[in-house]
């Protein structure tokens, strides 16, 4: 990967990832030198008879880096702050080839939950306020509600008319993605505006 | 029908602001986020970011923070882009388009053509 | 961010002929969406998650990929298919869009 244009490699929190290198055909590979913003990760002198030197130079990732028999990087237990710019350096007898990374670290969402804020109107319409979250969102992650195969909501909220008079028992299910995974969580407006009315007669009495 | 009607054509002189506005009908605005894209003269389309039309928080690409600001009138359904201190270099057509989902953009204003000359 | 690399820039090509064009991203992404844009007029959805057709999309239209890789083809060109094509990706922020291509009459 040339350092024009870095290779972006996805990472999930917590589990590994490799940086893929691709060695010069045919040539002899004096050392590789490993960065990490810039700043030094590893430094690696392979030899054609025995095991290379491996000299790991950022003690904050050392525990956690391993290299393939390629030199590849390998990461493990991925953190947030690993996220950054990666780059390799494979110096040769005649020339020093440069591959770049972007290492992006993503989350497996987890926890999906639904906060309903809804209200029943005298002619017994009942309009739902519906919040949809996921633990640490951040803005890689997409969210949107569903009914019947429609999108009602490209967003984490949904405001919507119910009227029980008219519609049919009716699902509303939101979804939260990312590149990495997805999440669901559906709710029944049956069931929710039963809970309002019963709140509405309950204060009426 | 689904429609997102923009402001028409502006010429402004380098320094100046704009507003531009977006109105939108026939569905509820407050469900969908809406979305600016720029797109320069003879170039391709770039994603200047979006505005959470139920909390009316904005989200702004690298390139646009700064200068650029939305914001939303709920009552009367219409999200705004606002550019100020406007250079040469902000000449274009700039859309406001509906989020779908997924950021699938689905229904786009027609356009609104900023020009900056002194 | 994610770039998006489209290519070829331009495709000239007669009537009926079978159009392909590539859409290739710098990370791989869940999945691509692609809009159809002619002169003077707002870009149009065209493609939504990869394979499926927007409203009013003629089935000569069809769309594939994962990971990287995304492709649009168009079967057999009409005289209205002739515009510019570009991609789009929804993984990761900033929402990046392909530098289009156009597909012109030969």
């Known amino acids: 990967q040339s350092s024009l244009t870095p290779l972006m490699v996805n990472g999930i929190l917590g589990e590994s990832v490799t940086l893929p290198l691709e060695f010069p055909a045919g040539e002899k590979v004096n050392f590789i030198t490993w960065l990490f913003n810039e700043t030094s990760l590893a430094f690696i002198v392979p030899h054609e008879t025995k095991s290379p030197e491996i000299h790991v130079t950022n003690p904050k990732q050392g525990k956690r880096l391993n290299f393939t028999q390629s030199y590849s990087l390998q990461l493990s237990n991925l953190k947030m702050e690993d996220t950054g710019s990666y780059r390799a350096q494979i110096s040769t007898k005649t020339s020093a080839k440069l591959s770049s990374y972007t290492l992006r670290i993503l989350r497996q969402l987890r926890n999906i939950q639904v906060t309903n804020h809804s209200q029943l109107f005298q002619n017994m319409t009942c309009e739902l306020h519906l919040t949809c979250s996921v633990e640490d969102a951040d803005d890689n992650v997409s969210f949107r509600w569903e009914a019947l195969g429609n999108t009602l909501s490209s967003q984490p909220n949904l405001t919507v008319s119910w009227d029980p008079r008219i519609s049919s028992e009716q699902d509303y299910t939101c979804i939260a993605e990312n590149a990495v995974s997805n999440l669901s969580f559906s709710v029944s407006a049956q069931k929710l505006c039963e809970d309002v009315k019963i709140q509405y007669t309950d204060t009426k009495m | 029908q689904i429609q997102l009607v923009q402001s028409g054509s502006e010429l402004k002189k380098p320094g100046a602001s704009v507003k531009v506005s977006c109105k939108a009908s026939?569905?509820?605005?407050?469900?969908?986020?809406m979305n600016w894209v720029r797109q320069a003269p003879g170039q391709g389309l770039e994603w200047m970011g979006w505005?959470?039309?139920?909390?009316?928080?904005?989200r702004y690409a690298d390139d646009f923070k700064g200068r650029f600001v939305f914001s939303l009138d709920k009552s009367v359904s219409t999200a705004y882009l606002q550019i100020s201190s406007l250079k040469a270099e902000d000449t274009a057509v700039y859309y406001c388009?509906?989020?779908?989902?997924?950021?699938?953009?689905?229904?786009w204003g027609q356009g609104t053509t900023v020009t900056v000359s002194s | 961010q994610i770039v998006l690399s489209q290519s070829p820039a331009t495709l000239s090509l007669s009537p009926g002929e079978r159009a392909t064009m590539s859409c290739r991203a710098s990370?791989?992404?869940?999945?691509m969406h692609w809009y159809q844009q002619k002169p003077g007029q707002a870009p149009r959805p065209w493609i939504y998650?990869?394979?499926n057709l927007a409203s009013g999309v003629p089935a000569r239209f069809s769309g594939s990929g994962s990971g990287t890789d995304y492709t649009l083809t168009i079967s057999s060109l009409e005289p209205e298919d002739f515009a510019v094509y570009y991609c789009?990706?929804?993984?990761?922020?900033?929402?990046?869009f392909g530098g289009g291509t156009k597909v012109e009459i030969k």
């Open positions: 388009a509906r989020d779908y989902g997924r950021w699938y953009f689905d229904v």
């Open positions: 026939g569905y509820t605005f407050t469900n969908y986020g």
């Open positions: 505005i959470n039309t139920y909390s009316g928080e904005p």
């Open positions: 990370s791989s992404v869940s999945h």
């Open positions: 998650a990869t394979s």
């Open positions: 789009q990706q929804w993984s990761s922020t900033p929402r990046t």
